[in-house]
């Protein structure tokens, strides 16, 4: 048996980007790591030229992780930089609740990173708070839209908000600029991931911008503050909609209704479909001005028919402990229309 080896030697001419040295200044950053790596591709048997990222022009590899606390000089040896992407992780944590309360941080991709010739895939902020002491509020520079099948996001990036507690499988949703969500309050540790979907993110980068603040602790898993536009229908969905709202979780929407408008609240199912093992699933719709509330037992009754609200109102959903396979997920919409009669 003769062993035959067939190989090819490829001499790569440095591309324009390879001649450049890029400075990534992470010296003022804390608890941050930046990874440049090959983006996943379908395996093919065809030979693909190497694609390397070099640190200080000396150490070259297909993957490179840069950590905070210093300045890094990097260069590329690659025929096609679209084969690489960047993933960044940054942790913002609070250990002393007295020091952190009301403190704010800007969740923005540093310009150094945006200027690199490699596409940013994910920039994740892990936001950690002392348990049962503080909660978090996310305030976007531009109001957000929740991505739903009925109204998908069509921007070049989205914010993916999920719980960062290992035991908790809770995904609040995907949000993009250009909607009606003014702020998102969350009870405990979360990760906020800015995910890009198109190279045009570079041009749209100015639309990104979230501020996170540490606020006094509250018991609900999440509170969405919604200020609908008169022009469009707002679609809102319960967190974890594909897997169902976690057991015994409560979420609320604070929906503002301008003085000259009427809000129509519509649910997209007749029944919630949840079957409870322990407790019951309830939805409470409460008028903020009069405090009058309507209570619906989601596991026993049909969902309400479209209702009209002349004043700001709350929608609160509290889950039971459901039987497997019969989970709670609700989609509803809010539409504003001008008031025809003054109903003060």
């Amino acid at each position: 048996g003769i062993l035959r080896l067939q190989f090819q030697v490829l001499v790569q001419h440095p591309q324009n980007e390879s001649n450049k040295i890029y400075v990534v200044d992470l010296s003022n950053e804390r608890a941050m790591s930046l990874t440049i790596e090959p983006r996943p591709v379908k395996q093919s048997r065809k030979f693909v030229p190497g694609c390397f990222v070099c640190l200080e022009s000396r150490t070259c590899s297909s993957n490179l992780t840069l950590t905070s606390g210093s300045k890094h000089k990097i260069s590329f040896l690659c025929d096609d930089l679209t084969r690489l992407w960047m993933n960044v992780e940054k942790t913002i944590s609070c250990t002393d609740h007295r020091y952190c309360q009301r403190k704010s941080y800007s969740l923005q991709v540093p310009s150094d990173i945006l200027h690199l010739p490699v596409e940013l895939h994910d920039f994740s902020w892990k936001l950690l708070v002392p348990k049962d002491r503080l909660s978090l509020v996310l305030v976007p520079a531009q109001k957000l839209q929740q991505h739903t099948h009925e109204k998908p996001c069509n921007t070049s990036f989205s914010y993916l908000v999920a719980s960062a507690i290992p035991s908790q499988d809770l995904y609040f949703g995907s949000f993009c600029p250009g909607g009606s969500i003014k702020q998102i309050q969350v009870k405990q540790n979360i990760s906020v991931t800015l995910r890009t979907f198109a190279p045009s993110f570079q041009q749209e980068a100015s639309r990104q911008g979230l501020t996170v603040s540490f606020i006094p602790y509250f018991k609900e898993e999440g509170v969405f503050t919604v200020t609908p536009d008169t022009k469009s229908k707002v679609y809102l969905r319960t967190p974890n909609w594909d897997r169902g709202l976690p057991s015994l979780t409560s979420v609320s929407w604070n929906i503002s209704v301008p003085r000259d408008q009427v809000a129509c609240l519509t649910f997209f199912k007749e029944r919630s479909g949840v079957v409870c093992q322990t407790g019951r699933a309830f939805m409470i719709i409460q008028e903020q001005r009069t405090r009058a509330e309507e209570i619906f037992s989601l596991d026993e009754d049909v969902l309400p028919k479209p209702s009209f609200h002349h004043h700001s109102f709350w929608v609160n959903i509290s889950n039971c402990s459901p039987t497997s396979g019969k989970q709670l997920d609700l989609l509803f919409s809010v539409t504003l229309t001008p008031r025809t009669v003054d109903l003060t």
Partner: antibody, heavy 126, light 107 residues
Amino acid sequence: EVQLLESGGGLVQPGGSLRLSCAASGFTFSNYAMNWVRQAPGKGLEWVSAISGGGGSTYYADSVKGRFTISRDNSKNTLYLQMNSLRAEDTAVYYCAKESITMVRGVMDYYGMDVWGQGTTVTVSS
Amino acid sequence: DIQLTQSPSFLSASVGDRVTITCRASQGISSYLAWYQQKPGKAPKLLIYAASTLQGGVPSRFSGSGSGTEFTLTISSLQPEDFATYYCQHLNRFPRTFGQGTKVEIK
């Protein structure tokens, strides 16, 4: 003031029918599940039936299943109990009672009957 | 269906006495239990829900404890207005059932 007022009781022959009503006031009736509970002379309390706030779910004790029907008219703030094929053992004072909805240790549920009517007497006798 | 057994069925006590009534469930009901007080010719009154939570307006001499299958209602110092019949009721889904009752009489 939160109040429940039963009516419709009376004397009926075995095999006969009767319809009890319970008029509610002082609270948002449609928000709460409602119950019928009875008490035979000199005996203890017996839960009879319940209905969810929206009327979408109904529940019955085995002793009345198939004979009694609970219903509600939220526009009239009224709870009903239609009793058919009455037997001597159905003789009792019938109370309507409101379920309380409370959250206890993170679990929201019905946690007992916090408001009761004064009761209406049903006598089944020939 | 879940059966509830109360003990004792009758209890004679004096004003100032500490009184304990027991309620046993035929299967585990977590803390899904309520206690009611009923006086002759009157409708029952909710005293305690979720096994140990005192209903608003109920005097603090009443207390409840237990979980699973064994529950107790305690009156720390019996008052003249406490002579009545007491019922436990399970709240763990429908059908709901009551215990047979415990009559507290004056000794």
